[in-house]
C-alpha cells in the first residue's frame, strides 16, 4: 500500500524540530532562515534527502498516485531552491509527533490521546476552545469572531497548523457572479505520536464519504487510533469527525450544492502554527482583497430582497451576520435552499461556541 503520507509526515516532523516547533507544511521547507541556523542550510538538506529516500522507497506502491508525484516534484524544487546536494547525510528518524502542552510534569500520565482529559489533569481546568465556520458564498466566521464574505476562487487554507490542515476549494456560484461556493474540502489530520497515523479526508459536492481516503473510519492501528473517528447522522449530507486527541470536532454538511465546514478546536491546537503559515481563513478571516461587501451582491433569478429576507427570517429571527449572509446567498443564487446552510451554521455555532454571548455577530456594513 502507498505510504507516501508517512514520508510527508516524517518530513514535516523533522523540519518541525529544525524550526523550533513550528510546522513547515508538507512541502514548504520552512523558508530560508529558521531558528538555530538549521533550516536553509545543512539541516533542511538532510531532511530533504531523507524525504527523497523515503519517497523513492514508496515508488513501487505509489508511483501511479498524485501524492507521490507531488512529493517528488516538491522535493526537487526545494532541493534546487536550497542548493542541496543529492549526496550527503540524511536526517535521523523523527519523533513520532508533536508533544501536547504540559508533557513532562510529575503527575501520573493521563491518556495522551484524550486532549481534554490530559489538559484538565495537567492544568486543573478545561482547555479553551475556538470555533470557525465556512458556509455559503463562502462566509467565514473566524476564531476571532470576524465574519467575512469571501470571493476566493480555487483552493484556500481554512486551517494550517501543526496538527491539522483544512483546505476549501471554491468556484463561482454562477456565471459572472463575484460570489463563490465551496465545492471541495480536504482535511489532513497529521500523524501524531501513539495516537493516529496521518489521515486524509476529502469531501466533494455529491460525495461526502463516511471514511478517510484510505477507507478507514478511525485513526489507524496505533494504541490511540480510536481517538479519531468519523460518523454521520444523515448519509450524503452530513459528516462529523471527532478528533479527541486534539480536542477537535468537525462538521461537514452539503446543502444547495455547496459544502459547509464547522470546527470546534482546542485553543492551543488552533494556535500551534508558525509565521510561514500565516494564510488561514479561520485565523485571519478573508484577506482584505478577497472580501465582498453586501453592496456587491448582484441578484440572480426571480427572488426579490423582500422574499429573501422573509425566507431567511423564518429560520433566523435575529438579523445578525448569519441572517444577512442568508439573504446574500438566496439573492445571488436564486435558490431558497441556501437558507439551510446559514441556519445549520448558526446551530453549529450555538453548539460549538464556548461563549454564547458571541453567537450573534452584527456586520458593520
Amino acid at each position: 500500500q502507498c505510504k507516501i503520507l508517512r514520508c510527508n509526515a516524517e518530513y514535516v516532523s523533522s523540519t518541525l524540530s529544525l524550526r523550533g516547533g513550528g510546522s513547515s507544511g508538507a512541502l514548504r521547507g520552512g523558508g530560508g532562515g529558521g531558528r538555530g541556523g538549521g533550516v536553509g542550510s545543512g539541516g533542511l538538506c538532510r531532511a530533504l534527502r531523507s524525504y527523497a529516500l523515503c519517497t523513492r522507497r514508496t515508488a513501487r506502491t505509489c508511483r501511479g498516485d498524485l501524492a507521490f508525484h507531488s512529493a517528488v516534484h516538491g522535493i526537487e524544487d526545494l532541493m534546487i531552491q536550497h542548493n542541496c546536494s543529492r549526496q550527503g547525510p540524511t536526517a535521523p528518524p523523527p519523533p513520532r509527533g508533536p508533544a501536547l502542552p504540559g508533557a513532562g510534569s510529575g503527575l501520573p500520565a493521563p491518556d495522551p490521546c484524550d486532549y481534554e482529559g490530559r489538559f484538565s489533569r495537567l492544568h486543573g481546568r478545561p482547555p479553551g476552545f475556538l470555533h470557525c465556520a465556512s458556509f455559503g458564498d463562502p462566509h467565514v466566521r473566524s476564531f476571532h469572531h470576524h465574519f467575512h464574505t469571501c470571493r476566493v476562487q480555487g483552493a484556500w487554507p481554512l486551517l494550517d497548523n501543526d496538527f491539522l490542515f483544512v483546505q476549501a476549494t471554491s468556484s463561482p456560484m454562477a456565471l459572472g457572479a463575484n460570489a463563490t461556493a465551496t465545492r471541495k474540502l480536504t482535511i489532513i489530520f497529521k500523524n501524531m505520536q501513539e495516537c493516529i497515523d496521518q489521515k486524509v479526508y476529502q469531501a466533494e459536492v455529491d460525495n461526502l464519504p463516511v471514511a478517510f481516503e484510505d477507507g478507514s473510519i478511525n485513526g489507524g492501528d496505533r494504541p490511540g487510533g480510536s481517538s479519531l473517528s468519523i460518523q454521520t447522522a444523515n448519509p450524503g449530507n452530513h459528516v462529523e469527525i471527532q478528533a479527541a486527541y486534539i480536542g477537535t470536532t468537525i462538521i461537514i454538511r452539503q446543502t444547495a450544492g455547496q459544502l459547509s465546514f464547522s470546527i470546534k478546536v482546542a485553543e492551543d491546537v488552533a494556535m500551534a502554527f508558525s509565521a510561514e503559515q500565516d494564510l488561514q481563513l479561520c485565523v485571519g478571516g478573508c484577506p482584505p482583497s478577497q472580501r465582498l461587501s453586501r453592496s456587491e451582491r448582484n441578484r440572480r433569478g426571480a427572488i426579490t430582497i423582500d422574499t429573501a429576507r422573509r425566507l431567511c427570517k423564518e429560520g433566523l429571527p435575529v438579523e445578525d451576520a448569519y441572517f444577512h449572509s442568508c439573504v446574500f446567498d438566496v439573492l445571488i443564487s436564486g435558490d431558497p435552499n441556501f437558507t439551510v446552510a446559514a441556519q445549520a451554521a448558526l446551530e453549529d455555532a450555538r453548539a460549538f461556541l464556548p461563549d454564547l454571548e458571541k453567537l450573534h455577530l452584527f456586520p458593520s456594513d
Partner: antibody, heavy 115, light 112 residues
Framework: EVQLVESGGGLVQPGGSLRLSCAAS????????MNWIRQAPGKGLEWIGM????????HYADSVKGRFTISRDNSKNTLYLQMNSLRAEDTAVYYC????????WGQGTMVTVSS | DVVLTQSPLSLPVTLGQPASISCRSS???????????LEWFQQRPGQSPRLLIY???TRFSGVPDRFSGSGSGTDFTLKISRVEAEDVGVYYC?????????FGQGTKLEIK
Amino acid sequence: EVQLVESGGGLVQPGGSLRLSCAASGFTFSNYGMNWIRQAPGKGLEWIGMIYYDSSEKHYADSVKGRFTISRDNSKNTLYLQMNSLRAEDTAVYYCAKGTTPDYWGQGTMVTVSS
Amino acid sequence: DVVLTQSPLSLPVTLGQPASISCRSSQSLESSDGDTFLEWFQQRPGQSPRLLIYDVSTRFSGVPDRFSGSGSGTDFTLKISRVEAEDVGVYYCFQVTHDPVTFGQGTKLEIK
C-alpha cells in the same frame, strides 16, 4: 465508502471488441493510479494493467499488450478498458481496483469470447 | 516474470483451529532499498477479492487480528489463528516488488 462499479461486459465473438467502464465513487478518483485485473472461470487472478492518476503512464501484462488499452476520464470519475482482437482465452470476470497497488476492488463484469 | 507458488492448493480446516498458507517466490521479493512488497488477498465465494495484508505483515484497515502475515526473501506465510466460517474462500499472495506484478495461483480454504 469506496465504490467501484464495472459495466460493459457481455458476449463477443473472437476477433471482436468490447469497452469496459468502471465508475468510481467514495474517494478522489483523480488522485489515484488504477488497475484492471481479470479472473478466468474457476481460475486465479491475472493482472492486466494499470494507469497513472493523470494518464501519463500505462503498464500492461504481456498477454494483452497491443490489444488492450486502459484510459480514464477524471472529470467523470471513470476508468475504461478497451479490448480489441479478443480471443477465447480472454473470457473472464474483469475487475477494476483502486490504487497503484490494488486495495479496493469492484464486483467485476463478465466477458465471454465465443463463437 | 516472478512466479509465486502457493501451498497447499486446498486447505480443509476445522472451525476454531489455526490455518497456515505458504507462498514461495521464484526470486527474492526484497527490493534494493530493503523493502518487501508482498500482499495477501481473500476472495470469498461469489465475491471480489479483498485486501488482507500488505508489506508482508501489515493488516489492512478493518481486517480482524486473527489474520497475520510473515516471511522474507522468497518464503512467506499467511496465518489464521482461529478459523471462522466467514473465512471460507480462496487466498492469493501478490507481489509488487518486480514488474510485472504477479499473483499466486490461490489456496482454497474450506471447513472440514
